[in-house]
Amino acid sequence: DGCKDIFMKNEILSASQPFAFNCTFPPITSGEVSVTWYKNSSKIPVSKIIQSRIHQDETWILFLPMEWGDSGVYQCVIKGRDSCHRIHVNLTVFEKHWCDTSIGGLPNLSDEYKQILHLGKDDSLTCHLHFPKSCVLGPIKWYKDCNEIKGERFTVLETRLLVSNVSAEDRGNYACQAILTHSGKQYEVLNGITVSITERAGYGGSVPKIIYPKNHSIEVQLGTTLIVDCNVTDTKDNTNLRCWRVNNTLVDDYYDESKRIREGVETHVSFREHNLYTVNITFLEVKMEDYGLPFMCHAGVSTAYIILQLPAPDFRAY
């Protein structure tokens, strides 16, 4: 069919709750493309009817909720004007009753469900909730060993649980819970997280390293489209946020009206000792006001910027 297979992603998921997967592969999906989801090599696309339990929502496939029989390989086809790429997503659904100790341990869960706290440090756990814009998430509640977490050492901040002065007793089974509202219906999302405690700082210390950009300028013509990647290495267990800012504001917020400059969806590659993260910034059309402004990539406490500048005039043209 002329489509190039990009990669296979494996996801292990809990039944009876919502799940969403976004078909994104920068820079392919940053241009004018159409995205279509298929199940198990079916020739007919996944429905876009929002009442359908499994449906496509923009570039996402959304399960409301996931059921045991949904296990299988799903294909996402990304078609551009002159290109076709395909991503395979292998979903394995398991029945998990988080508070039922009689049921055996979890299968090999992804790193999102295995997190590490550093002994004696102030640290945090992240509740990974990836859903399309049509899904509204309520406030997150945190549980440890099935009891809601309370106490001065714990603070809930957006999707994170801040833990001050981590102790050995903080290891164990955690869960974060949120109510998701979609098209007027409510669903419970409950993510289990197995937390271990470590004393070592890990790969290269706990400060993320921005590989690119390197506080430099980029020559770019007025009116052109520009995509710049921010590449970051960080520990596998990190809870740092990575984002692009301008004038100390998230670019998506700063350009909320025009959407002319947008932050891409973060991707990462897992290595033995660390992760390499990529999050891009897209200028749909470079304007005069963009020149000379530092566009900052933030990764935890680390920052690096790019500054756009007009190319020097080419006098050979005269």
């Epitope: 279509t36 696309p45 429905s47 009817i49 009442q51 814009k133 509204v136 007027g184």
Partner: antibody, heavy 116, light 107 residues
Framework: EVQLLESGGGLVQPGGSLRLSCAAS????????MSWVRQAPGKGLEWVSA????????YYADSVKGRFTISRDNSKNTLYLQMNSLRAEDTAVYYC?????????WGQGTLVTVSS | DIQMTQSPSSLSASVGDRVTITCRAS??????VNWYQQKPGKAPKLLIY???KRPSGVPSRFSGSGSGTDFTLTISSLQPEDFATYYC?????????FGQGTKVEIK
């Protein structure tokens, strides 16, 4: 060019039945969810029913549930609406529309009049 | 179910005028609104989808914006062929609901 052409409308008595058809062309029919939307004389648009590309799942507005049945024949590129137990308030122009998920293409409509 | 309320229900304007139509949802829909144009005796036509995207062939004088509960369709400079009824509809909400319509008439 995407084209949707409805047929089957007409005058029917209350309690009667009618079957509407919508012939589609210019796109891969089975790749798209399809829908019926109606418009009573001088009134606004009202969604009636929708069906998934494979035809396996169907959805209805409360006002027609149990009386109307949506179906499709992907080999014939045709969408259907079987309307039973028709009432005076079902009088409307019925449009078939492609669902993507916005209603991106519409037929010209077929008028259904329910009157004794 | 969600209710979409359009205002005004009708308006009179002249060629060249800037026209704004508002659509208010009965609850926050957090997602997108589509806009349709319908001329008398004709089928509706998709004008704006996902808040601010125009299908090919729709002139740039039509634009959409908004979020939460309030959404707007703007015609920057009204043309003779724009006199019609306009409907809003939330994209990711079920059952599919349309606003009651806004009729744009010649002053």
């Amino acid at each position: 060019e995407v084209q949707l052409l409805e047929s089957g409308g007409g005058l029917v008595q209350p309690g009667g039945s009618l079957r509407l058809s919508c012939a589609a062309s210019g796109f891969t029919f089975s790749d798209y969810d399809m829908s019926w939307v109606r418009q009573a004389p001088g009134k606004g648009l009202e969604w009636v029913s929708a069906i998934e590309g494979a035809g396996s799942d169907t959805y209805y507005a409360d006002s027609v549930k149990g009386r109307f049945t949506i179906s499709r024949d992907n080999s014939k590129n045709t969408l259907y609406l079987q309307m039973n137990s028709l009432r005076a308030e079902d009088t409307a122009v019925y449009y078939c529309a492609r669902l993507a998920p916005e209603f991106d293409y519409w037929g010209q409509g077929t008028l259904v009049t329910v009157s004794s | 179910d969600i209710q979409m309320t359009q205002s005004p229900s009708s308006l009179s304007a002249s060629v060249g005028d800037r026209v704004t139509i508002t659509c208010r949802a009965s609850q926050s829909i957090s997602s997108y609104v589509n806009w349709y144009q319908q001329k008398p005796g004709k089928a509706p036509k998709l004008l704006i989808y996902q808040n601010d995207k125009r299908p090919s062939g729709v002139p740039s004088r039509f634009s959409g914006s908004g979020s939460g509960t309030d959404f707007t369709l703007t015609i920057s400079s009204l043309q003779p062929e724009d006199f019609a009824t306009y409907y809003c509809q939330p994209s990711f909400y079920f059952p599919y609901a349309f606003g009651q319509g806004t009729k744009v008439e010649i002053k």
